[in-house]
């Protein structure tokens, strides 16, 4: 199967599935990290 072209920046090209989605709130401890738009 051919790979596909991406519309996101190249920094993600060699990532893995455990890359955090920083566009959503993340609650790993008692503190919640909210990344602004």
């Amino acid at each position: 199967m051919d790979s596909f072209n991406y519309t996101t920046p190249d920094y993600g090209h060699y990532d893995d599935k455990d890359t955090l989605d920083l566009n959503t709130p993340v609650d790993k401890t008692s503190n919640t990290l909210r990344v602004p738009d």
Epitope: T8, Y14, K17, T19, D21, T24
Partner: antibody, heavy 119, light 110 residues
Framework: EVQLVESGGGLVKPGGSLRLSCAAS????????MHWVRQAPGKGLEWVGR??????????DYAAHVKGRFTISRDDSKNTLYLQMNSLKTEDTAVYYC??????????WGQGTLVTVSS | QSVLTQPPSVSGAPGQRVTISCSGS????????VSWYQQLPGTAPKVLIY???QRPSGVPDRFSGSKSGTSASLAITGLQAEDEADYYC??????????FGGGTKLTVLG
């Protein structure tokens, strides 16, 4: 052409062992995290485990149901991913796929190889 | 039982719009990206949506993805006969494992 080709599947008795291979071509294999995913006949997709690239640390993680029995390794000089399966159970019967990760998704999949565990 | 919850089946007539939901928790969908895959009978899965809402080149814009909190959804508009397939959502989990939905069988009526 970017391609993954699995091999090594077949019929094995419960308690037996099998080693699957996944040959990569058309891309810089060493730079990518690689995963194994399986699918029992008529069932859904089930994650087996992964190995990160050397640049990412080369670490492995496994699903609970295969931990201690399955081992994932890679030979970047041969552009090949491996899945060593020991102490096989009937419930391990499935089509096994290798998959490449890019942009947080499985963007390239192999065609799959069938493993049948039966006495 | 799958960590991510999808409806077992959905159906729609040609030209209609259908959505497939995928429910998770703060340890997976709430923290990590969601992907959607299409699997036609006897073939390997193919990615339709990556990073929640991004579409690979070659995938028709009839397919769209969204994510809100701990849930995600796949929408298919202008349903076509060739869309009949199994669809899976997918994410990572804090417990260092990948998680899939149980899959949804899409039937195109008529």
């Amino acid at each position: 052409e970017v391609q993954l080709v699995e091999s090594g599947g077949g019929l094995v008795k419960p308690g037996g062992s099998l080693r699957l291979s996944c040959a990569a071509s058309g891309f810089t294999f060493s730079s990518y995290a690689m995963h194994w995913v399986r699918q029992a006949p008529g069932k859904g997709l089930e994650w087996v485990g992964r190995i990160k690239s050397k640049a990412q640390g080369g670490t492995t993680d496994y699903a609970a149901h295969v931990k201690g029995r399955f081992t994932i390794s890679r030979d970047d000089s041969k552009n090949t991913l491996y899945l060593q399966m020991n102490s096989l159970k009937t419930e391990d019967t499935a089509v096994y796929y290798c998959a490449r990760v890019s942009f947080s998704t499985f963007d390239v999949w192999g065609q799959g190889t069938l493993v049948t565990v039966s006495s | 039982q799958s960590v991510l919850t999808q409806p077992p089946s959905v159906s729609g007539a040609p030209g209609q719009r259908v959505t497939i939901s995928c429910s998770g928790s703060s340890s997976n969908i709430g923290s990590y990206y969601v992907s959607w895959y299409q699997q036609l009978p006897g073939t390997a899965p193919k990615v339709l949506i990556y990073r929640n809402n991004q579409r690979p080149s070659g995938v028709p814009d009839r397919f769209s993805g969204s994510k809100s909190g701990t849930s995600a959804s796949l929408a298919i508009t202008g349903l076509q006969a060739e869309d009949e397939a199994d669809y899976y959502c997918d994410s990572w989990d804090h417990s260092s494992m990948n998680v899939f939905g149980g899959g949804t069988k899409l039937t195109v009526l008529g």
